[in-house]
């Protein structure tokens, strides 16, 4: 046969040769020839390549910059990049997690529907009728209004989404 024009999986075509790609964690030093194999070298410390490749340089591991609120969630290997996450109370601004912002607090009248994580912000919801929140918080849910009846009291002041009801004693009819 003549030299190939297409190659198998995990191979690449160069100078009419099908050469083996370098495995993850290794970079290309020299292409194969008619007489020699592809030559690959392991990536150095703090470097990686995560696919079968013909790259002549490995990629640098991501740096989790503490000045941006980042910390290492998973240390990189020669085959994987470092995964960053945010310090407690902060979350990533993007999927790539290149910087962090402080978790949002839910204003009075709103409660926490879902507490923030390292990668997602706080989700707030308006307090429905019968519930209130009188604080700005990243953790507090809407609280139910106090039930005056169960305390043998009556409502003296109606509740809102920001305030609880005010209970008072029942008026006693004089004999």
């Amino acid at each position: 046969p003549e030299p190939p024009t297409a190659c198998r999986e995990k191979q690449y075509l160069i100078n009419s040769q099908c050469c083996s790609l370098c495995q993850p964690g290794q970079k290309l030093v020299s292409d194969c020839t008619e007489f020699t194999e592809t030559e690959c070298l392991p990536c150095g410390e703090s470097e990686f390549l995560d696919t079968w490749n013909r790259e002549t340089h490995c990629h640098q591991h991501k740096y989790c910059d503490p000045n941006l609120g980042l910390r290492v969630q998973q240390k990189g290997t020669s085959e994987t990049d470092t995964i960053c996450t945010c310090e407690e109370g902060w979350h990533c601004t993007s999927e790539a997690c290149e910087s962090c912002v402080l978790h949002r607090s839910c204003s009075p009248g709103f409660g926490v529907k879902q507490i923030a994580t390292g990668v997602s912000d706080t989700i707030c919801e308006p307090c429905p009728v019968g519930f209130f929140s009188n604080v700005s918080s990243a953790f507090e849910k809407c609280h139910p209004w106090t039930s005056c009846e169960t305390k043998d009291l009556v409502v003296q002041q109606a509740g809102t989404n920001k305030t609880d009801v005010v209970c008072g004693p029942q008026d006693r009819l004089r004999a």
Epitope: S30, D31, E34, F35, T36, E37
Partner: antibody, heavy 112, light 112 residues
Amino acid sequence: EVQLVESGGGLVQPGGSLRLSCAASGYSITSNYYWNWVRQAPGKGLEWMGYIRYDGSNNYNPSLKNRITISRDTSKNTFYLQMNSLRAEDTAVYYCARLDYWGQGTLVTVSS
Amino acid sequence: DAVMTQSPLSLPVTLGEPASISCRSSQSLENTNGNTFLNWFQQKPGQSPRLLIYRVSNRFSGVPDRFSGSGSGTDFTLKISRVEAEDVGVYYCLQVTHVPFTFGQGTKLEIK
């Protein structure tokens, strides 16, 4: 087109040494490939002697290992064969080769 | 070392007829990647060797398609589908999977 040109052959005294040159053109000897020396005694077959790689490292035929050195001068795009303690059996045509391209050969005669 | 044994050592052929040369290795020439570095060379009288086939079955550029190579592991064959007068010479197999590289003894093809 790759071209290889040997020089340095001739008559050598037994016990003497030789230094053959191989000037490469059309391709850098530092780019890739292994740059070989192969010899052929009169009326005999081919014998691989050794190579110098594109990165400067070597491999030699164990039968000759203690007597030969392959080196290079990258500025001249040339590689060399140094051979010591020559004997009559070393009389041969010496070829430099990338294996897909060969020099024309240079005759070395070991005789007193 | 991988010892390469060619047969026959002499091959008289009629013009236009096919010819076949065998090359056997004392050890497998397939490497860990599944590649086999077995090559065939032609050497005409008074000339340098010329690469015909590399990696068992790949024809080198400019080689007529009447030349073909096959085989695997330890057994390899060079075939000439229809011999022409210009094919006269000595044919060598060479393995470069293992160091030292080793040639077969050569097969002399002549016209009957």
